[in-house]
Interface confidence: medium
C-alpha cells in the first residue's frame, strides 16, 4: 500500500493576511485565523512529518479584499509560489479581470501547474494561452506519480469575464477523455481538482470513470467528521464518500473558504492504484499555529503600499449619498440605489442575443448600509469612505429564486416596518409598492420587475412561478436579517465579488455620480 497526503484549499478569496473568525478584517490578533503565513507553518510541519504530500488549490484565489484590488493577482502568484503549491484549478473568479488579468499576473508567473480540462480556447487566444494552463498534469510524488485533472464551473461566463474566446464545456464530458488519456499513460492514481461546487463534485465522483479522489471548491462547503472546531456547520462527513457508477468508493472533499482551514486528507492506494482507505479532517488554522516569520515579513512588505490606497480618490459625488439608517431602513435611499446600480453594472454579461443582460434585479438589506458620504468634502469618495458604508467584507452574489420567494422576501422587508430594523430592502430593477395599513405578510400591493429577455428593458408584474436571477449580498443569500425563505428556497447560489470592490469599480468607471431617489420603492396613499 502507498499513502498520499492531500492538503487543499479553495475559495481563499484574497485572504492573504490572517482574519477574524468570520473571515473579515483581523482586529484582535490573538483570536485571528488563517492567512498565508499561518498556512505555511502548518504545511511545512506536515511536509516534514509525512513522506508523500501534495498541496492543491481548487480555485477562486482571486477577489475578496483590497489585496486583489491593488495587486490584481500578482499577490496570488507570489505567495502561492512561496508556499510551493503543487497545482491549482481555475475558478470562476480568476477571470474577473478578463483573460489578460489571468494570463499576465498568474499564469505567466506561477511556478506550479494551473489546470482546467473543460475550458477550451479558440480564435487568436488559443495560441496566446497555449501551455499556460493545462487540462491535467502528472506529478511525481515520492516513488509514484499522481495525475491531477482540473475543471471549472461552466457557469463562469455568467459569473465573471472570460470573454468570447474561451468555451466552458460540460465538466463530466470534458473530464472523461483526459482521465482516459492518463490511464493510457499508466497513471493509476487520479485526483479531480476543480471549481464547480459540491453537487458537481459528487457527480464527477459518480460519473467519471478512473477518478479516485475529488477535491472541490466554489460552494464553500464545510465537511467535518466529529465535533467541528469553529462556527461552520458541516454539510456532511469529511471525506464525503460517493459510490461511483462502477462501484468504487470515491472520497470528495472541500475545505470551506477564506483560508480558514487547511484540508487534510490521507489516502491509501493499493499497488493497482485503487483507494483502500481515506480519512482526515480540515485543520482549523487558529492562533495556536504560529505565523511563519519569513512569510509574515513578506506580507508586511506588500502591505506598505496597500495602506496608502485607502485614502486615494476613486471618483466624485455631486450629491449627498444618504446612507443613514433613518433613510435606508424606512424608505428608498440614494445610497441603496447607488449600491444596487453598481451591483447590476458589475454583472453585465451579454452572453445571449435574446437577453440584454442575464440579470436585472438587485435587493439589498437597508441594515447593511452603515454610513452616508457627504459631498461637501470636495465630492471625494475614497475606499476608506466606502469601507465605512460597507464594513462587513461581504460579497454581492448571484442567486436564482422563484417569484414566490421574492414576494415573501418583500413581505418580510416590511413585516415589522417602523422599528428601524435592517431587513427593509433597497432595490434595483424592481418597483415595489407597499400598503402598510394591511396586515404583515400581505403588504406588497405591487411588485414589478425589469425584464431581461427584451431589447428595451421595461417593468412587468412579477410572476410567482417564474425563476429570476437576483444580485444580493451574501448575508441575504445565507438567510441573514430573517430572510430564511431566500436561504431555504434558492435554486442556485454563486458567490460574487467583494462588496466594496464592486462599488469602488463602479464609481471609478462613472467618475462623477449623482444617484437620486426615483420611486423604486413607494407606499400607497394614506398608509405612510
Amino acid at each position: 500500500a502507498w499513502e498520499l497526503t492531500i492538503l487543499h484549499t479553495n475559495d481563499v478569496h484574497s485572504r492573504l493576511e490572517q482574519t477574524s473568525e468570520d473571515s473579515s478584517k483581523c482586529v484582535n490578533a490573538s483570536r485571528c485565523m488563517g492567512g498565508v503565513a499561518r498556512l505555511f507553518t502548518k504545511v511545512q510541519q506536515i511536509r516534514r512529518a509525512e513522506p508523500n504530500v501534495l498541496l492543491l488549490d481548487a480555485g477562486d484565489q482571486y477577489q475578496g479584499t483590497i489585496w486583489f484590488t491593488v495587486y490584481k493577482g500578482a499577490e496570488v502568484a507570489h505567495f502561492m509560489n512561496a508556499l510551493r503549491y503543487d497545482a491549482m484549478a481555475l475558478g470562476n473568479h480568476e477571470f474577473d479581470n478578463g483573460v489578460e488579468g489571468l494570463i499576465e499576473p498568474l499564469l505567466k508567473e506561477a511556478k506550479f501547474p494551473i489546470l482546467s480540462a473543460n475550458i477550451k480556447a479558440k480564435g487568436p487566444l488559443a495560441s496566446q494561452i497555449s501551455g499556460l494552463y493545462l487540462p491535467y498534469k502528472v506529478l511525481p510524488v515520492g516513488d509514484e506519480v499522481v495525475g491531477i485533472v482540473g475543471y471549472t464551473s461552466k457557469e463562469t461566463p455568467f459569473l465573471s469575464n472570460p470573454g468570447t474566446n474561451l468555451v466552458f464545456e460540460d465538466e463530466i464530458t470534458a473530464l472523461q477523455p483526459e482521465v482516459d488519456k492518463l490511464k493510457t499513460l499508466n497513471v493509476n492514481k487520479i485526483i479531480a481538482l476543480g471549481h464547480s461546487g459540491f453537487e458537481m463534485d459528487k457527480l464527477i465522483a459518480q460519473k467519471v470513470r478512473g477518478v479516485d479522489v475529488v477535491v472541490g471548491g466554489h460552494s464553500n462547503t464545510f465537511l467535518y467528521t466529529g465535533n467541528p472546531p469553529s462556527k461552520e456547520v458541516p454539510a456532511g462527513k469529511y471525506p464525503f464518500i460517493v459510490t461511483s457508477d462502477d462501484g468504487r468508493k470515491v472520497p470528495v472533499v472541500q475545505a470551506y473558504a477564506f483560508g480558514k482551514y487547511l484540508g487534510y486528507l490521507k489516502i491509501e492506494f493499493d499497488e493497482r492504484g485503487n483507494v483502500i482507505s481515506s480519512h482526515g479532517n480540515p485543520i482549523l488554522l487558529n492562533s495556536s499555529i504560529p505565523e511563519d516569520p519569513s512569510i509574515k515579513a513578506d506580507i508586511n512588505k506588500w502591505r506598505i503600499k496597500l495602506d496608502n490606497y485607502s485614502t486615494q480618490e476613486l471618483g466624485k459625488t455631486i450629491v449627498y449619498l444618504d446612507g443613514s439608517s433613518q433613510s435606508c431602513r424606512f424608505r428608498e435611499c440614494n445610497m441603496g440605489n447607488l449600491i444596487c446600480d453598481a451591483m447590476i453594472n458589475n454583472n453585465l454579461r451579454h452572453t445571449d442575443e435574446m437577453f440584454w443582460n442575464h440579470v436585472s434585479m438587485c435587493i439589498l438589506n437597508g441594515g447593511g448600509i452603515r454610513s452616508p458620504i457627504d459631498e461637501r468634502n470636495n465630492g471625494t469618495i475614497t475606499w476608506e469612505n466606502l469601507a465605512a458604508v460597507l464594513p462587513f467584507g461581504g460579497t454581492f452574489d448571484l442567486v436564482q429564486l422563484k417569484g414566490s420567494t421574492l414576494k415573501k422576501a418583500f413581505e418580510h422587508s416590511v413585516h415589522r416596518y417602523g422599528q428601524s430594523t435592517g431587513e427593509f430592502l433597497q432595490v434595483g430593477g424592481i418597483h415595489v409598492v407597499y400598503d402598510l395599513s394591511r396586515k404583515p405578510g400581505d403588504r406588497v400591493v405591487k411588485l414589478d420587475v425589469l425584464c431581461t429577455k427584451c431589447r428595451v428593458p421595461s417593468y412587468d408584474p412579477l410572476k410567482m412561478d417564474e425563476v429570476y436571477k437576483v444580485i444580493l449580498p451574501n448575508f441575504l443569500a445565507n438567510g441573514g436579517d430573517g430572510f430564511q425563505m431566500i436561504k431555504d428556497e434558492l435554486l442556485r447560489h454563486d458567490s460574487g465579488d467583494q462588496d466594496i470592490n464592486v462599488v469602488s469599480t463602479y464609481i471609478s468607471k462613472m467618475k462623477v455620480i449623482y444617484p437620486a431617489v426615483e420611486g423604486r420603492i413607494k407606499f400607497s396613499t394614506g398608509s405612510h
Epitope: 491593488v70 495587486y71 499576473p105 508567473e109 516569520p293 519569513s294 503600499k305 495602506d307 496608502n308 490606497y309
Partner: antibody, heavy 120, light 111 residues
C-alpha cells in the same frame, strides 16, 4: 533582459507641464511597481512617487502631490510622469526605476532608466 | 517621513583601503528580522545602480568587496580593497514606509 528606456530631454517654460515616458521591456510590466525619482543638478535623489501598472494604483510624495501625475499604459508597457506648474527649481534629471520582486529586492530599485533632463 | 543622514559627506581613500559609509535613519526601519535599507552607487552622468538590498544582500553582478550591515536605525556600507572604479556617489534608501526617502549621499574619491 530588463530595460527601461526614457523619452528625450525637454526644455519648458515656468508654469508649463512636462510629461516624461518610460518604456519597459524584458519582464512582466504589470507585476512590478515603477518609481519616479528626480535629481537636481549636483543634488541628491528625491523619491517622487510610484505606480503599480497592474491596477494603476499610485503613491505620491506629499511634496509633489498636487503637481505630479503618474500613469501607466499596459498595452505599450509604458509608464508616464507628468509634472505641472513647473518652476525653475524643477530643473533636474528625472529617472524611472523598476522596484524589485518582493521575494528578493523588496522595493529596492533594481533597474533604472537612463534619465531625462528637464530644464525649466 | 523618515530622514536618512549619511556620513561622511566625502571620503578620500587610496586603492586597497577599506571604505566605511554610514547611514542613520530618524526612525527604526527594521521589522520581523528584515531591514528595509538599500544602497546605490552613482557615477557622474549615469543612473544609480543597486548594490545592496535589505541592508546586507548583495545584488547580482555586484563585486563581493561590497557588503552591508546594520539593523534598526544604523547602517553601514563597506567597500573592501577599494578600486579606482569605485569612485562615485553612494546613496542609502529606505522602504519601510511611504514616502520612501534617500540619504543626501556620500562622495567617495580615490587618491
Amino acid at each position: 533582459q530588463v530595460q527601461l528606456v526614457q523619452s528625450g530631454a525637454e526644455v519648458e517654460k515656468p508654469g508649463a507641464s512636462v510629461k516624461v515616458s518610460c518604456k519597459a521591456s524584458g519582464y512582466t510590466f504589470t507585476s512590478y511597481w515603477i518609481t519616479w525619482v528626480r535629481q537636481a543638478p549636483g543634488q541628491g535623489l528625491e523619491w517622487m512617487g510610484d505606480i503599480y501598472p497592474g491596477s494603476g494604483n499610485t503613491n505620491y510624495n506629499e511634496k509633489f502631490k498636487t503637481r505630479v501625475t503618474i500613469t501607466a499604459d499596459k498595452s505599450t508597457s509604458t509608464a508616464y510622469m507628468e509634472l505641472s506648474s513647473l518652476r525653475s527649481e524643477d530643473t533636474a534629471v528625472y529617472y524611472c526605476a523598476k522596484e524589485g520582486g518582493l521575494t528578493t529586492e523588496d522595493y529596492a530599485l533594481d533597474y533604472w532608466g537612463q534619465g531625462t533632463l528637464v530644464t525649466v | 517621513e523618515i530622514v536618512l543622514t549619511q556620513s561622511p559627506a566625502t571620503l578620500s581613500l587610496s586603492p586597497g583601503e577599506r571604505a566605511t559609509l554610514s547611514c542613520r535613519a530618524s526612525k527604526d526601519v527594521s521589522t520581523s528580522g528584515y531591514s528595509y535599507m538599500h544602497w546605490y552607487q552613482q557615477k557622474p552622468g549615469q543612473a544609480p545602480r543597486l548594490l545592496i538590498y535589505l541592508a546586507s544582500n548583495l545584488e547580482s553582478g555586484i563585486p563581493p568587496r561590497f557588503s552591508g550591515s546594520g539593523y534598526g536605525t544604523d547602517f553601514t556600507l563597506t567597500i573592501n580593497n577599494i578600486e579606482s572604479e569605485d569612485a562615485a556617489y553612494y546613496f542609502c534608501q529606505h522602504s519601510r514606509e511611504l514616502p520612501f526617502t534617500f540619504g543626501q549621499g556620500t562622495k567617495v574619491e580615490i587618491k
